[in-house]
Interface confidence: medium
């Protein structure tokens, strides 16, 4: 059903009577109608809603609505549905964001890093080295570093001091008469925290832009996306550089070699010598499903001088 | 539940003045074009004016043209017809209608003017 | 301005038969026509726009039919709350109204 609308502060639009060849101004129709009749020296214009599938985002004097853009493409979803005010709009789930004009998983800041800032749907998740006094020791893209326990507000003494991937352990003072025990939630890392490499075990997930591979040859691995990895410092393990972070080092150049240690493979990630990492600027905008219709539509974007 | 309600009909004499008002409810006002319609008593209707949704464009049946003037206050959800020059044929139940692509979907029950000395 | 004639100016039919009212216009109003109806002491009611469009929550034993001048309002079977007088408008050249046709109880 037709309906005769307009907003409160209607303007108008020129429109040649083909009939008279005069030229008259009507009233434009509001946004979510276009005009199914223009004015003439007897008859006001008349509106119509917009068809299922058309919007008109303003009020204009056009004589068809927009075309919505088409479904969202696969990973993205609905941000915004095709109606008669608004085009469909498309938008990253959650957990990923705009890359491209599809949709990457957040980075997912490894061990020793947390997260700086909250990835977000046109915004990639920013990681940065845990500060001293905190840890991070489980890879997370929404995590930020966790401070040590205090072991002296529990009356406990730190039996193994925290690093940047773990917590500090606190036990009791050693005495002669009862072993040493950790307190409860709290775990012992046996191994040596002092390595060159960073062991990750190939299961652990691997961060993106720290990928394996599964060929022996040495691959450099630098995808853009380790630009999200904010603060120019490496994850770095060595005691010598705990304490000291550099700001100005960039980051490190990644390779993945692929190890044998008797029967368990393990991919090393070895830092090289870094070369600068530079990232693309990230649009804000919000992502459209292709257009249907005539293609000279994308060209001009919906404008239309009876339309703004 | 759209809802018109016309008021300010009344007797006047001859060459007198009516305000006649018209409260919308139920729907945005701001957003329709209004008509005024008259009915004589016992005679067919008889379109009287119409008001473009802003104010900006009003229309009149050449028997009150120069006599009659439509307004709207947007703010108030208020169609008027300001009625000057009264003669004993404007005597008429006078309806305010919502405008549906220049016909008239909704009315009021209307308001009687009498012009009679 | 156009005129808009309306016949017959009353119509005695019993209810379940067929009204048949007419409306002429002086000159072509294309298919820019609308019916309506009233009852005493109310207001009209919109019945059918554009010649052939029933108004929301109108029956569909209203029907309207033609274009150009000549316009026809059909109820295929009067119900009892039927009889009134039944209006035909035009929007061409602005509004005008037809004089009404009355469809009464025989």
């Known amino acids: 059903q037709p309906e005769q609308k307009a907003s409160n502060l209607i303007g108008t639009y020129r429109h040649v009577d083909r009939a008279t060849g005069q030229v008259l101004t009507c009233d434009k129709c509001p946004a979510g109608t276009y005009v199914s009749e223009h004015c003439t020296n007897t008859s006001l214009r008349v509106c119509s809603s917009c068809p299922v599938g058309t919007f008109t985002r303003h009020e204009n004097g056009i004589e068809k609505c927009h075309d919505c853009s088409q479904p969202c493409p696969w990973p993205m979803i609905e941000k915004l549905p095709c109606a008669a005010l608004t085009d469909r709009e498309c938008t990253c789930p959650p957990g990923m964001f705009q890359s491209n004009a599809t949709c990457a998983p957040h980075t997912v800041c490894p061990v020793g890093w947390g997260v700086r800032k909250k990835g977000t749907e046109t915004e990639d998740v920013r990681c940065k080295q845990c500060a001293r006094g905190t840890f991070s020791d489980v890879p997370s893209s929404v995590m930020k570093c966790k401070a040590y326990t205090d072991c002296l507000s529990q009356n406990l003494v730190v039996i193994k001091p925290g690093t940047k991937e773990t917590d500090n352990v606190c036990g009791t003072l050693p005495s002669f008469s009862s072993s040493t025990s950790p307190s409860p939630g709290t775990a012992i890392f046996p191994r040596p925290e002092h390595m060159e490499t960073h062991e990750v075990p190939s299961s652990t997930y691997v961060p993106k832009g720290m990928n394996s591979t599964e060929s022996n040859s040495s691959a450099s691995v630098r995808p853009k996306v380790l630009s999200s990895i904010q603060e120019g410092t490496v994850p770095d393990n060595t005691s010598s550089a705990r304490g000291k972070e550099d700001v100005n080092k960039t980051l490190p150049n990644l390779q993945v070699v692929n190890h044998q240690q008797g029967p368990h493979h393990r991919h090393i990630l070895k830092l090289l010598p870094s070369m600068e990492a530079t990232g693309g600027e990230k649009s804000s905008t919000p992502i459209k499903g292709p257009k249907r219709g005539h293609p000279r539509q994308n060209l001009h974007k919906h404008f239309d001088i009876n339309e703004h | 539940e759209v809802q018109l309600l016309e008021s300010g009909g009344g007797l006047v004499q001859p060459g007198g003045s009516l305000r006649l008002s018209c409260a919308a409810s139920g729907f945005t006002f701001s957003e329709y074009t209004m008509h005024w319609v008259r009915q004589a008593p016992g005679k067919g209707l008889e379109w009287v004016s119409v008001i473009s949704s802003s104010g900006g464009r009003t229309v009149y049946a050449d028997s009150v043209k120069g006599r009659f003037t439509i307004s709207r206050d947007n703010s108030k959800n208020t169609l008027y017809l300001q009625m000057n020059s009264l003669r004993a044929e404007d005597t008429a139940v006078y309806y305010c209608a919502r405008d549906l692509s220049n016909y008239m979907d909704y009315w009021g029950q209307g308001t009687l003017v009498t012009v009679s000395s | 301005d156009i005129q808009m004639t309306q016949s017959p100016a009353t119509l005695s039919l019993s209810p379940g038969e067929r009204a048949t009212l007419s409306c002429r216009a002086s000159q072509t109003v294309s298919n820019y026509l609308a019916w309506y109806q009233q009852k005493p002491g109310q207001a009209p009611r919109l019945l059918i726009y554009?010649?052939?469009n029933r108004a929301t929550g109108i029956p569909a034993r209203f029907s309207g039919s033609g274009s150009g001048t000549d316009f026809t309002l059909t109820i295929s079977s009067l119900e009892p709350e039927d009889f009134a007088v039944y209006y035909c408008?035009?929007?061409?050249?602005?509004?005008?109204f037809g004089g009404g046709t009355k469809v009464e109880i025989k």
């Open positions: 408008q035009q929007r061409s050249k602005w509004l005008s």
């Open positions: 554009d010649a052939s």
